[in-house]
Amino acid sequence: ALDTNYCFRNLEENCCVRPLYIDFRQDLGWKWVHEPKGYYANFCSGPCPYLRSADTTHSTVLGLYNTLNPEASASPCCVPQDLEPLTILYYVGRTPKVEQLSNMVVKSCKCS
Amino acid sequence: ALDTNYCFRNLEENCCVRPLYIDFRQDLGWKWVHEPKGYYANFCSGPCPYLRSADTTHSTVLGLYNTLNPEASASPCCVPQDLEPLTILYYVGRTPKVEQLSNMVVKSCKCS
């Protein structure tokens, strides 16, 4: 699987999850998030050669098409597969609130 | 929606579904498919600027990050959203068989 366990341990050029740290205030302008100050959102990147973690029949077909037609511009793209939530602390005035934000952290990628 | 109705009628540079005809024999080397000879598989391509048909909170966050950090290499990618099946006719010996192949035709795209 093209997950953090594999991708963070290997120098993988093809589609894989890459580490990306986002600082809420500096990178997003979100002053309202109190904790954490930032988090590893990660992202997916890298070429999608034929059959690499293909998501659907279409991405398999497109990968094969691309292999047999190297000049073609149509190819699958490396995108998130599994995402996890992030728990944050913010304040409503002086009152602390805890919220779970869904689909914030990429754990693995696929060719789609 | 970034679907065929919209994308095929507009000269859209950003993420959109594009027409792609695949000939089973010539483009894939699939001699076993009798009918159709080919089909419009289509594909997704084009930049994913901030907030364009974002798929998840992560892709929205990544788009926002990319907007505020233009030098960043991390950005969402244009991939299939809705896919449709394709019905094909093939032969097992002299016996015709009809099969529905799932997820063969891209109908719309998203930024993921």
């Epitope: 997003l28 302008g29 979100w30 002053k31 309202w32 913010y90 304040y91 409503v92 005035g93 002086r94 009152t95 919220e99 934000l101 | 907030l51 909170t57 929205t60 966050v61 926002l64 907007t67 505020l68």
Partner: antibody, heavy 120, light 108 residues
Framework: QVQLVQSGAEVKKPGSSVKVSCKAS????????ISWVRQAPGKGLQWVGG????????NYAQRFKGRVTLTADTSTNTVYMELSNLRTEDTAVYYC?????????????WGQGTLVTVSS | ETVLTQSPGTLSLSPGERATLSCRAS???????LAWYQQKPGQAPRLLIY???SRAPGVPARFSGSGSGTDFTLTISSLEPEDFAVYYC?????????FGQGTKLEIK
């Protein structure tokens, strides 16, 4: 420059609903919280609630809970306020306003206001 | 909820004079959860002061805010003709946000 442009005036019957829009431009929409404040004719200001774009976290004044829904459409940089089960005392000018950054905060830019009239 | 009481209800002064507007909270707001706004007829409120004493961008230096706890003051050092309006204080320490009933500053 920062602008908040609201939808036009509405006349509604008691018991019905109204949805007011507020389109933001001139700044990074998803970086700021949007609050809604109303002002009855000749009266003071009353906070309705606020919403955080992207994550759609909304906070409401207790008196409006269950009747008001605040949502943000990040694809169009637009925030919506829907108020249901309208009463005549809901007749007011409704303003959207950008906060300085926190969920509860001072508000530095305001929309032009939308007059909602509730009358039978 | 936190009740804000503004005084006086109406203040009659002449251009060039000093205006002092008061805002009292029913419970302590600390030192940084109070804002002041100016509103003219038919217009949206305009932010003047936030954090009790910080001037918003573009606000003239004649406007100043002070105070902490339960007592806050907006001072206009020398009134200009365009300053005659209604002034509201707002607290954002606790939900719900609340506003004072307003002080009308009118020309004497």
């Amino acid at each position: 420059q920062v602008q908040l442009v609201q939808s036009g005036a509405e006349v509604k019957k008691p018991g019905s609903s109204v949805k007011v829009s507020c389109k933001a431009s001139g700044y990074t929409f998803s970086s700021n919280v949007i609050s809604w404040v109303r002002q009855a004719p000749g009266k003071g200001l009353q906070w309705v609630g606020g919403v955080i774009p992207i994550v759609d976290i909304a906070n409401y004044a207790q008196r409006f809970k269950g009747r008001v829904t605040l949502t943000a459409d990040t694809s169009t940089n637009t925030v919506y306020m829907e108020l249901s089960n309208l009463r005549t005392e809901d007749t007011a000018v409704y303003y959207c306003a950008r906060t300085l950054g926190l969920v509860l905060d001072a508000m530095d830019y305001w929309g032009q206001g939308t007059l909602v009239t509730v009358s039978s | 909820e936190t009740v804000l009481t503004q005084s006086p209800g109406t203040l009659s002064l002449s251009p060039g004079e000093r205006a002092t507007l008061s805002c009292r909270a029913s419970q302590s707001l600390g030192s940084s959860y109070l804002a002041w706004y100016q509103q003219k007829p038919g217009q949206a409120p305009r932010l003047l002061i936030y954090g009790a004493s910080s001037r918003a961008p573009g606000v003239p230096a004649r406007f100043s805010g002070s105070g902490s706890g339960t007592d806050f003051t907006l001072t206009i050092s020398s009134l200009e003709p365009e300053d005659f309006a209604v002034y509201y204080c707002q607290q954002y320490a606790d939900s719900p946000i609340t506003f004072g009933q307003g002080t009308k500053l009118e020309i004497k």
